[in-house]
């Protein structure tokens, strides 16, 4: 048994690193194996993480930490029995992917203006949690080619758009995602999309 | 509001001990490391030793093994520290503070210190 | 055991002045934290973990450095902030302090 590609791990910068990696054939990532993780710390002990197959090959494990801050780093062993297989580290600073937003809402009756409002995925004392910029995709289900990004380069969640920049009387679906500059993360998953019917009043026309 | 409350300050004779408490109130106390610093002369700072209130572990520094034992009452929420053999060179104020892996070790509250005096 | 050297010993600064003190350790490591300290009264938490303020510090505050070489910064120093500041490692056992460094305000 051997490690076709080496684990390769992302941390949400809060309690969860998830790594993947390959072995030389399809394999029974649970019973089989086990990745063993500690942080370099005179107080940590070492944890074990029991992966999930992800394809016939592949194998994925959720590391759980208690909290994470930029200078921490991880011994990562991955055995099959009393094998090693493979032993490397991880610095979860340096390998970032935010949690996506949640509770994505949009708020149709600011006159003809649609606010859309979602919550931070990281609480107040989180170190992400000021400095999150976001994307929001909104996109025609009638039309794919009406498919549009707003970049939100501010803090606050939020985006408020002209009704009138979309197409009257059609739905529209929207979703959000994250990422942070500091850590030069990669984007978050998408939220899950929500739905509404764009409508607004076309103005009069003056002659 | 999470508070550590040590007792009040100690006249001791050569070859004493003392038990020092630090009553700790506002937080779940087995979640969180109990560890010990000494201050000697108004300036250096020691750390003693911690112990985890949910099991009894404890971590020592080397040059305190066999003048400080640290324990635990969980009922009463207090952490004990324990001087024996005392000597002039354990004059000092013996701060309690809150620690753990959380914060790598950091202690983000501490007792309002206990005066040891060690005279003859 | 790590040996934590801390400059300047005393650090006289007028309020609005930028000041660093800094915090050198004889071998490598990973966390290093800060405590202020004023007579006649415990340490306060202060930074953890290199460059994480503690609850309620001000933002004119910051911490930075890596291997053997920290600092502690504040961007305009003003009358409250004397004290004496204290490093902490927190790698290789026993954790140790520093000496302290003194700030003055003139």
């Known amino acids: 048994m051997k490690v076709l590609q080496e684990p390769t791990c992302v941390s949400d910068y809060m309690s969860i690193s998830t790594c993947e990696w390959k072995m030389n054939g399809p394999t029974n990532c649970s019973t089989e194996l086990r990745l063993l993780y500690q942080l370099v710390f005179l107080l940590s002990e070492a944890h074990t993480c029991i992966p999930e197959n992800n394809g016939g090959a592949g194998c994925v494990c959720h590391l759980l930490m208690d909290d994470v801050v930029s200078a921490d780093n991880y011994t990562l062993d991955l055995w099959a029995g009393q094998q090693l297989l493979w032993k490397g580290s991880f610095k979860p600073s340096e390998h970032v992917k935010p949690r996506a937003p949640g509770n994505l809402t949009v708020h149709t009756n600011v006159s003809d203006t649609l606010l859309l409002t979602w919550s931070n995925p990281y609480p107040p004392d989180n170190y992400l949690y000021n400095h999150l910029t976001y994307a929001v995709n909104i996109w025609s289900e009638n039309d794919p080619a009406d498919f549009r990004i707003y970049n939100v380069t501010y803090l606050e969640p939020s985006l408020r758009i002209a009704a009138s920049t979309l197409k009257s009387g059609i739905s529209y679906r929207a979703r959000v995602r994250a990422w942070a500059q500091c850590y030069n993360t990669t984007w978050s998953e998408w939220s899950p999309s929500t739905k509404w019917h764009n409508s607004y009043r076309e103005p009069f026309e003056q002659h | 509001d999470v508070q550590l409350q040590q007792s009040g300050p100690e006249l001791l004779k050569p070859g004493a001990s003392v038990k020092i408490p630090c009553q700790a109130s506002?937080?779940?106390?087995?979640?969180?490391?109990m560890d010990w610093v000494k201050q000697s002369h108004g300036k250096n700072l020691e750390w003693i030793g911690n112990i985890n209130p949910n099991n009894g572990g404890t971590f020592y520094n080397q040059k305190f093994k066999g003048k400080a034992t640290l324990t635990v009452d969980k009922s009463s929420s207090t952490a004990y520290m324990e001087l024996r053999s005392l000597t002039s060179e354990d004059t000092a104020v013996y701060y309690c503070?809150?620690?753990?892996?959380?914060?790598?070790?950091?202690?983000?509250?501490w007792g309002q210190g206990t005066s040891v005096t060690v005279s003859s | 055991q790590i040996v934590l050297s801390q400059s300047p010993a005393i650090l006289s600064a007028s309020p609005g002045e930028k000041v660093t003190m800094t915090c050198r350790a004889s071998s490598s490591v990973i966390y290093i934290h800060w405590y202020q300290q004023k007579p006649g009264s415990s340490p306060k938490p202060w930074i953890y973990a290199v460059s994480n303020l503690a609850s309620g510090v001000p933002v004119r505050f910051s911490g930075s450095g890596s291997g053997t070489s920290y600092s502690l910064t504040i961007s305009r120093v003003e009358a409250e902030d004397a004290a004496t500041y204290y490093c902490q490692q927190w790698s290789v056992n026993p954790p140790t302090f520093g000496g302290g460094t003194k700030l003055e305000i003139k």
């Open positions: 503070g809150r620690g753990g892996l959380r914060r790598r070790g950091f202690l983000d509250y």
């Open positions: 506002g937080y779940t106390f087995t979640d969180y490391n």
